[in-house]
């Protein structure tokens, strides 16, 4: 910017250096140059001589005007034209901001990646500032009413160390910058129920030689979390629409889910857990793909007739990607397919 | 109970320096977020800066790029070092609990005064 000029005069904008975006705004330029009477004063947005709305209001001062002003940034100078110089001559030059009051902070939501050591709180800020706005995350303790603060741009990680106090919190965020200030709704937070397990991931997969060939995928993660909820989604890579099955978890062991799939197709399988119980996800793992293996015998293909041995109630729904590149964003479609898993065998195997 | 005592005030000339400072004791400084605020004569309280636990900081605009807020927390102490002073920072200079907000909980305060 131009903030560390040296002025030979004075340059002051009405109402402030930083307003509110599309506000009517005045811009002051008044020289105190020694020897020179001004013919004329010249201000300058970014660099480019400005014609229009300026008025001479004495001898020493001109103003220009501004109607709705709407760029965020602007850097404006002014200048002297004085007798005899073949230059004009810098009075003085000042940055100008526009934008808006922060909105009210919304969605917020805390969770704690186990082993991470952190609280990871996230919100979304709303509309654009254009200005710098900040944010300040109050945690207070149900238990102590102590409350600690921090200070974050767009999300912040908070020490469990910091939390040992107490189990309860009540979190909330305020939004803050030169134009407003505006506070969140504030969520109610035990530490108890905020945690995602590990990682969850597909270690790999393999196409058996059956009669009717099956998939078994392996997935795997270092949760201690006992019970944990998780869901496996999958589809062909040809396809928008997603299968998803669930299942009840133990990682003591490597989980092993068989599924029932077209032939000579390419499937991408992820998954995502959650401790059983509990609303927070983990995001789904990273893709893995896998071939299935060709066609041995002639028959007609049924996906959705795999031979279950017992059916349960549990469901597997399929989801529509909105497109293919935002595979997080889904849309419910159905969920009317059974799962099932055999008689014998200590894990949770599907059809 | 909760003590804040503030020192470093005095008299400068425009463009001088000082470095405030506010010792703290009944309560767990270094897990604490502070701030100063300022009061000019006939004037209203006026938040200047603020600081949080993990050294993160935020300013009035009117000061940004002039102010520096610091804390040491082996010290319990919270500092403002004040460069290129203007006759406008002319004021009572007071700390307290809390990165944001334009109020104090009665600690007497330093007085800082710009003139030449």
């Known amino acids: 910017g131009i903030t560390s000029i040296n002025c030979s005069g004075d340059m002051w904008v009405e109402p402030g250096e930083i307003f509110q975006m599309g506000m009517n705004v005045s811009i002051y330029c008044q020289e105190a140059l020694k020897h020179c009477r001004p013919r004329n004063l010249y201000f300058y947005k970014n660099g480019f001589k400005e014609e229009f709305d300026i008025t001479r209001i004495n001898r020493t001062t001109a103003r220009i005007w501004y109607k709705g002003f709407s760029e965020p940034h602007a850097y404006m100078h002014c200048t002297a034209e004085c007798p005899g110089h073949f230059q004009e001559t810098l009075i003085c030059g000042k940055d100008i901001s526009s934008g808006h009051p922060p909105d009210a902070p919304s969605n917020l939501t805390c969770v704690i990646y186990e082993y991470s050591g952190n609280m990871t709180c996230t919100w979304n800020t709303g509309k654009p500032t254009y200005i710098d706005t900040k944010y300040i995350v109050h945690v207070k303790s149900l238990e102590t009413e102590e409350e600690q603060q921090y200070l974050a741009s767009s999300y912040v990680k908070i020490s469990t160390d910091s939390l040992q106090g107490s189990r309860k919190y009540l979190v909330w965020v305020q939004a803050v910058n030169s134009l407003g200030m505006e506070n969140s709704q504030q969520l109610h937070v035990h530490l108890d129920d905020i945690v995602i397990p590990s990682a969850s991931i597909i270690s790999r997969a393999e196409t058996t030689n059956d009669t009717v060939p099956k998939t078994i995928v392996y997935w795997k993660s270092k949760t201690m979390i006992e019970k944990v909820f998780c869901e496996m989604r999958y589809k062909t890579t040809t396809n928008q629409t997603w299968s998803v099955k669930e299942f009840d978890a133990n990682f003591t062991y490597v989980q092993q889910s068989e599924f029932y799939l077209e032939p000579d197709s390419k499937y991408v399988f992820q998954v995502r857990c959650q401790e059983t119980g509990k609303r927070n996800w983990q995001p789904w793992s990273s893709p893995f793909v896998h071939q299935t293996s060709q066609e041995t015998g002639k028959r007609n293909w049924q996906p959705w007739s795999s031979p279950f041995v017992h059916q349960t109630s549990q469901t597997v729904s399929q989801v529509t990607a909105k497109s293919s590149h935002e595979p997080q964003k889904m849309e419910m479609l159905s969920a009317t397919i059974f799962r099932g898993h055999p008689a014998s065998g200590n894990h949770q195997d599907i059809g | 109970q909760v003590q804040l005592q503030e020192s470093g005030g005095g008299l400068v000339q425009p463009g001088g320096s000082l470095r405030l400072s506010c010792a703290t004791s009944?309560?767990?400084?270094?897990?604490?977020?502070m701030r100063w605020v300022r009061q000019a004569p006939g004037k209203g309280l006026e938040w200047v800066s603020g600081i949080d636990s993990r050294g993160s900081t935020i300013y009035a605009d009117s000061v940004k790029g002039r102010f520096t807020i610091s804390k040491d927390n082996a010290k319990n102490t919270l500092y403002l070092q004040l460069n290129s002073l203007k006759t406008e920072d002319t004021a009572m200079y007071y700390c307290?609990?809390?990165?944001?907000?334009?109020?104090?909980?009665g600690s007497q305060g330093t007085q800082v005064t710009v003139s030449s």
């Open positions: 307290a609990q809390g990165v944001y907000g334009d109020t104090y909980s």
């Open positions: 009944g309560f767990t400084f270094r897990l604490a977020a």
